[in-house]
């Protein structure tokens, strides 16, 4: 038995103190308007369908419908007592998409269609989504619409995030195969892209793929191995979308950040988290030769988004995703370091001293020590009588070294009046000087040789 305490319907006149289900009249198998409770809330009856009259005489509206008097006021006990008839109107007024791929003006119409379908022994129609079929739900007042700020950031920055792929040559066939990939982001409309130095290491061919699927060959413009930042360039007609650099110095622990990358063509990977620490020393992290500070975040950084941007909620780059140390702890190179790198790179290129151009003379050499000299002398009777300098292992054909007259087994003992003790001394002078006046020990002769280094792409 039902107690009236549980009833949702307003108490109507003439209702029994206790509901007795046995006294309820039998109901038809199918109800056009769906089932509803009678005015007393005791018995299940057939509800009036949408648009049908409702009120005291006519009975209740079906499921999801409410009885509304012509003035738009929902029928109450008072209305009923006045015996004023209302109309059954759907409580929900927005369109819905049904599983039968039809759009219904409201939920009640979908329910009615579902009842008809079941009557014909077909599957019921269920709600697939709010809004018309094939149309996104764009309710500006929905929570999803109001609070998905991460998705908003991603939408804003994604076009400027690129996929980078490196290729190597097979040893004999010389066919190129992919060897590694990473991400990067565009910083200038004419195609300058920032990524990690470790992403574009060595003499690999670098291919860049944009969000729209267009692919380009990239040239390495500048690299800072220590800071792990590289600048590459693609030649693109027209303006490219760019990301702006924020101030990493103004970052606060607890700020939301988004790490985005492009590990596969035409796809982005997004992780999010907060800034844990704004300045973690590289030495602290056990990174070799790094005295740089890193941004620590719990946003997951992995091979897929390495080289991509770490952005704040304004879509400004505050770091380059760089490495994952342990689960839940990742690090990014601060944007202030990127700014410094880009400024210095611009200066170098303006002065024609970009790291892209490497000075080269075409020798392989090693530092000569007294023990190495003794060993070589034992092996070659005519080896020069020297105990330090740069010993030439190999002179590469068609290079400045060969043109200048350097030969294998020569020992460079001075360049431009400065004595040479090690191979490093030679490397340093090559970087600095445009002409190398060398004194070379060959057998037991000292020979003067002039070599003009050439500039090559690294």
């Amino acid at each position: 038995q039902l107690s009236r305490a549980g009833r949702s319907a307003p108490l109507a006149a003439g209702c029994p103190d206790r509901c007795e289900p046995a006294r309820c009249p039998p109901q038809p198998e199918h109800c056009e308007g769906g089932r509803a409770r009678d005015a007393c809330g005791c018995c299940e009856v057939c509800g009036a369908p949408e648009g049908a009259a409702c009120g005291l005489q006519e009975g209740p509206c079906g499921e999801g419908l409410q009885c509304v008097v012509p003035f738009g006021v929902p029928a109450s006990a008072t209305v009923r007592r006045r015996a004023q008839a209302g109309l059954c109107v759907c409580a929900s007024s927005e369109p819905v998409c049904g599983s039968d791929a039809n759009t219904y003006a409201n939920l009640c119409q979908l329910r009615a269609a579902s009842r008809r379908s079941e009557r014909l022994h077909r599957p019921p129609v269920i709600v697939l989504q709010r809004g018309a079929c094939g149309q996104g739900q764009e309710d500006p007042n929905s929570l999803r619409h109001k609070y998905n700020f991460i998705a908003d950031v991603v939408e804003k920055i994604a076009p400027a995030v690129v996929h980078i792929e490196l290729f190597r040559k097979l040893p004999f066939s010389k066919r190129e195969v992919p060897v590694a990939s990473g991400s990067g982001f565009i910083v200038s409309e004419d195609g300058l892209i920032v990524t990690n130095a470790h992403v574009v290491t060595n003499k690999h061919r670098v291919k860049v793929e944009l969000k729209n699927g267009a692919t380009y060959e990239a040239k390495i413009k500048d690299v800072d191995e220590k800071a792990d930042i590289a600048l590459i360039k693609i030649d693109h007609q027209g303006k490219l979308p760019v990301l702006l650099l924020g101030r990493s110095s103004e970052l606060r622990p607890g700020e939301f950040v988004v790490a985005i990358g492009s590990p596969f063509s035409l796809q982005n990977t997004v992780t999010t988290g907060i800034v844990s620490t704004t300045q973690r020393g590289g030495k602290e992290l056990g990174l070799r030769n790094s005295d740089m500070d890193y941004i620590q975040t719990d946003a997951i950084i992995n091979y897929g988004n390495s080289g991509g941007p770490l952005v704040n909620l304004d879509g400004e780059v505050i770091g380059i995703n760089t490495l994952k140390v342990t689960a839940g702890i990742s690090f990014a190179i601060p944007s202030d370091k990127i700014k410094k790198f880009l400024t210095e790179s611009h200066d170098r290129q303006a002065k024609g001293k970009a790291i892209t151009k490497k000075k080269y003379i075409g020798i392989r050499m090693m530092s000569l020590t007294s023990s190495k000299a003794k060993e070589l002398k034992d092996r070659h009777r005519d080896f020069p009588d020297v105990i330090s300098g740069a010993y030439i292992i190999e002179v590469i054909p068609d290079t400045p070294a060969e043109a200048g007259g350097l030969k294998e087994n020569d020992v460079i003992i001075s360049i431009n009046g400065q004595s040479v003790v090690s191979a490093n001394d030679v490397s340093d002078v090559i970087k600095r000087e445009s002409t190398l006046n060398m004194v070379v020990r060959r057998g037991n002769e000292d020979i003067m040789i002039t070599v003009i280094p050439e500039e090559i792409d690294p």
Partner: antibody, heavy 123, light 105 residues
Framework: QVQLVQSGAEVKKPGASVKVSCKAS????????MHWVRQAPGQRLEWMGA????????AYNQKFKGRVTITADKSASTAYMELSSLRSEDTAVYYC????????????????WGQGTLVTVSS | DIQMTQSPSSLSASVGDRVTITCSVS?????MYWYQQKPGKAPKLLIY???NLASGVPSRFSGSGSGTDFTFTISSLQPEDIATYYC????????FGQGTKLEIK
Amino acid sequence: QVQLVQSGAEVKKPGASVKVSCKASGYTFTDYEMHWVRQAPGQRLEWMGAIDPETGGTAYNQKFKGRVTITADKSASTAYMELSSLRSEDTAVYYCTREGYSYEGGGYYFDYWGQGTLVTVSS
Amino acid sequence: DIQMTQSPSSLSASVGDRVTITCSVSSSVSYMYWYQQKPGKAPKLLIYDTSNLASGVPSRFSGSGSGTDFTFTISSLQPEDIATYYCQQWTSYPTFGQGTKLEIK
């Protein structure tokens, strides 16, 4: 994980030919060259040749040129080495080995090897 | 052709000893590679690019050198290190040293 599984031992008569197979798994077969290296009893390892499984392009050690043929079946991820006009000094263990590549230095080496196939040439 | 000379061809050492093997090439090479081969087994890469340890190889193994002279070292010999060791270069095509057979005293 990367695995190279070779066919079983063979006994051949002088003048005959032998064909050894090498089934690769655990990596993209066409992204690496497959090489063949042999080792005669008490001798050093000796490189015979290589194939690019994608294109079928080959390279051979001059010493074996004309006697060795390396082929590959992409669909089966299998490489083959056939040595003809066998002589007693071809008695050796024949290995297939994948070309490895150093991302840092750009150097080449052999990173994975088959278990070896003993070919005995005897009359 | 590049000639490779590995020395010694065999050596006997005690557990815990420091063991050094050298490899000389007839003309300069960029890198040297070192392999370990146990009886009845295929060679196993230990050192790549002259001095880099291959994945899963114990740190007691190391390599050094440049140009024409290269060295392979086991800092503290262990019983499981008994094997033959080969050096390998790859300039125009791969060639191997004749091997060094290492035994326990």
